[in-house]
Amino acid sequence: HTAAQDNCTCPTNKMTVCSPDGPGGRCQCRALGSGMAVDCSTLTSKCLLLKARMSAPKNARTLVRPSEHALVDNDGLYDPDCDPEGRFKARQCNQTSVCWCVNSVGVRRTDKGDLSLRCDELVRTHHILIDLRHRPTAGAFNHSDLDAELRRLFRERYRLHPKFVAAVHYEQPTIQIELRQNTSQKAAGDVDIGDAAYYFERDIKGESLFQGRGGLDLRVRGEPLQVERTLIYYLDEIPPKFSMKRLT
């Protein structure tokens, strides 16, 4: 499947340019910034989305304790280098020849260096912890209802099989969604947990990446779930390599 044929748009990525110039006059969409063709029946990779974002006009207790190796995306936005499949290249550099290694979700996992820095492989992020705080409600949400709704959301909106939603933890007002996906588990066609988490993050922030769809209206048994804070932790298959200097 490619883009929506009727009006030639990309339902899963509004940061695209679409035209009916594919084989047999089919609608084909290309990501802004990279010009790469995207599959509009699934989520676009985070690397291509970040690249498109950077090219766009600028105005446009039961809880889990993240491990010592968990990464938080403190560096924010940058214009990434993506490989031909749309994945992050292991080494990223800026215009001033400062380079660093990233994981599969594009988060820096080493100290910054110069052009001599080597990043041998793209290390996979296999565990993502999405930490949410919801606005006060009349009462706590029912845990199993919350679990069911979030799993449904990730399946139906982000196309992530529920087997990759390892757990949903809840201690009012904190909700934690654990996404896990080992290399061996991920089959061809499976959405990457990093991409699902990025789409979810943007939805929560009211910056939906979907074409022409209303923003995310999260409800648990009809009760609105409004998020006031989001923190995302990334755990890689190989722990990150930072100098002690960074940790003090």
């Epitope: 499947h1 929506a4 339902p11 899963t12 029946s41 679990d147 069911a148 709704e149 799993r151 449904r152 399946r155 139906e156 909106r157 196309r159 099989h161 529920p162 087997k163 990759f164 390892a166 757990a167 654990e178 896990r180 588990q185 089959a187």
Partner: antibody
């Protein structure tokens, strides 16, 4: 309450096509994907595929690839399953079934549509 | 494809009996402690009805005499005290991997 109502029984000749409908009500149609399962007389259940009511695309059991097409009409909250190049072995009751919330279980089923393929 | 071996294919029991059906899967359907195994009841001429989801969770409105257990590749479905209305065919199903597959069914009869 959630309901899936299917179209009536069909009798078809070998080589023909059949299109079965499944009308959903009692919930937000685009919130849940719809599966199709068939059951030949006196036999077990066989999963044919699933359609995303949100996106409109489908994933099919390889066994039926090229012969089955699943579509949806959000304006009428209806899902369709079309099976082509019918043969006698396709004689079965065809069910639509909604995904449940969290674990891809099928929580609501249509009443079934008997499709008879006979010359 | 994941193969499902359900046994027995048929069984006869008396009202009040404890009935057990097993389902063995060709590969694990466990993902981080979540088992993508479900059980359905089908009465003659009717659509299947979900009884148990995620191996051991009772679907809303289903009597508590029905239960499920197991993980990985071996699963069990139990009726603690058989009732006349339980006469039906029971199926296990995995939704871990596409194509989703069902067990061959167990036809339950009253002695």
């Amino acid at each position: 309450q959630v309901q899936l109502v299917q179209s009536g029984a069909e009798v078809k000749k070998p080589g023909a096509s059949v299109k079965v409908s499944c009308k959903a009500s009692g919930y937000t149609f685009t919130d849940y994907s719809i599966n199709w399962v068939r059951q030949a007389p006196g036999q077990g259940l066989e999963w044919m595929g699933v359609i995303s009511t949100y996106y409109g695309d489908a994933s099919y059991n390889q066994k039926f690839k090229g012969r089955v097409t699943m579509t949806r009409d959000t304006s009428t909250s209806t899902v369709y399953m079309e099976l082509s190049s019918l043969r006698s072995e396709d004689t079965a009751v065809y069910y639509c079934a909604r995904y449940g919330d969290g674990y891809n279980q099928f929580d609501y089923w249509g009443q079934g549509t008997l499709v008879t393929v006979s010359s | 494809d994941i193969q499902m071996t359900q046994s027995p294919s048929s069984l006869s029991a008396s009202v009040g009996d404890r009935v057990t059906i097993t389902c063995r899967v060709s590969e694990s359907v466990d993902s981080y402690g979540n088992n993508f195994m479900h059980w359905y009841q089908q009465k003659p001429g009717k659509a299947p009805k979900l009884l148990i989801y995620r191996a051991s969770n009772l679907e809303s409105g289903v009597p508590s005499r029905f239960s499920g257990s197991g993980s990985g590749t071996d699963f069990t479905f139990t009726i603690s005290s058989l009732q006349p209305e339980d006469i039906a065919t029971y199926y296990c199903q995995q939704s871990y991997e596409d194509p989703y597959t069902f067990g061959g069914g167990t036809k339950l009869e009253i002695k």
